[in-house]
Interface confidence: low
Amino acid sequence: SHMAPTHRLQPSDVRKIILELRPMSKGLLQDYVSKEIGLPESNHSSLPCLSSDSQLPHINGSAILPYFRAIRPLSDKNTIDKIIEQLDKLKFQREPEAEVSMPADNFERKNFILAVLQQFSACLEHVLQSLNSGPQ
């Protein structure tokens, strides 16, 4: 299993990972929306985006990982596994992983998955924008 780094990645490395994550995230979201027609725009989950202890924009891998582990059984496992693999690189060793539970109700579960995918895509765009506009 990949060992989480004990240091922060350079912005250039973070950008590379985000560029890997972006098409996977976008594809998952588009596919889910097309298959689950009629689901409302969702604010069901509040996906943490940035690490609070870094001056540079840095995705909070430790906080986001459990959401993807939670939605994995009802999503495209192959793509989710690749997202988890990339998020693991962004995980800081000191940061513990929280437990995230899927809602029991089927409709709520769908909303939860949609929210995670929407918010993660938005998070990636936000961080990428910050990295592109900031000093390198």
């Epitope: 594809g27 588009q30 596919d31 059984p73 009802l74 793509t79």
Partner: antibody, heavy 118, light 111 residues
């Protein structure tokens, strides 16, 4: 209605190469999953490979490193490149769509026969 | 990889008979109330055709005499009243995890 039409099957010698084509109408290959499944003469079905809407690919262990699945979005066409062919690759190769959000193969092509023999 | 075991490998039955085919997975294919198990029919010289998806859902256009049941590792395809055109080989398949795997098939012959 969704239609899948395979072509490219042929008689090839061991160690040889072949490219199979699956032309899709009625659905976009940039949505869902698109698979190759094979069936040796008189035998059962074996999943070979898939390419997902986001371009993610996966392969059966028996073909990893020898077969490559790809697509041409503009032509709405899938391909399976078969290299270093072995006698045990002799089979009818079917193209199939995974529907129901990646749950089951709901549309299949008619198949194309690949024969590997010296 | 998940191994799929179908039984019987072949059977012979008469029109009007009730027929059951079993499929056992080497591990559970259930998650969040879904069973990722499907059934296909393949007639001689034809492509496979989806009959049942997610254990018990009848695919559009499939006659209602076909039904599926089961969860976890044990699943059954039932034909309530056999018709001559049901002569075919039937396969179960799991999509719970990669690689997606099929059962060995059950060849159904009509007497």
């Amino acid at each position: 209605d969704v239609q899948l039409v395979e072509s490219g099957g042929d008689l090839v010698k061991p160690g040889g190469s072949l490219r199979l084509t699956c032309s899709v109408t009625g659905d976009s290959i940039t949505s869902g999953y698109w698979n190759w499944v094979r069936q040796a003469p008189g035998k059962g079905l074996q999943w070979v490979a898939y390419i997902s809407y986001s371009g993610i690919t996966d392969y059966a262990d028996s073909v990893k490193g020898r077969f490559t699945i790809s697509r041409d979005n503009a032509k709405n066409t899938l391909y399976l490149q078969l290299n270093n062919l072995k006698a045990e690759d002799t089979a009818t190769y079917y193209c199939a769509r995974y529907g129901n959000y990646g749950y089951a193969m709901d549309y299949w092509g008619q198949g194309t026969l690949v024969t590997v023999s010296s | 990889e998940i191994q799929m075991t179908q039984s019987p490998s072949s059977l012979s039955a008469s029109p009007g008979d009730r027929v059951t085919i079993s499929c056992r997975a080497s591990e559970s294919v259930d998650t969040y109330g879904n069973s990722f198990m499907h059934w296909y029919q393949q007639k001689p010289g034809q492509s496979p055709k989806l009959l049942i998806y997610r254990a018990s859902n009848l695919e559009s256009g499939v006659p209602s005499r076909f039904s599926g049941s089961g969860s976890g590792t044990d699943f059954t395809l039932t034909i309530s009243s056999l018709e001559p055109e049901d002569a075919a080989t039937y396969y179960c398949q799991q999509s719970y995890e990669d690689p997606w795997t099929f059962g060995g098939g059950t060849k159904l012959e009509i007497k």
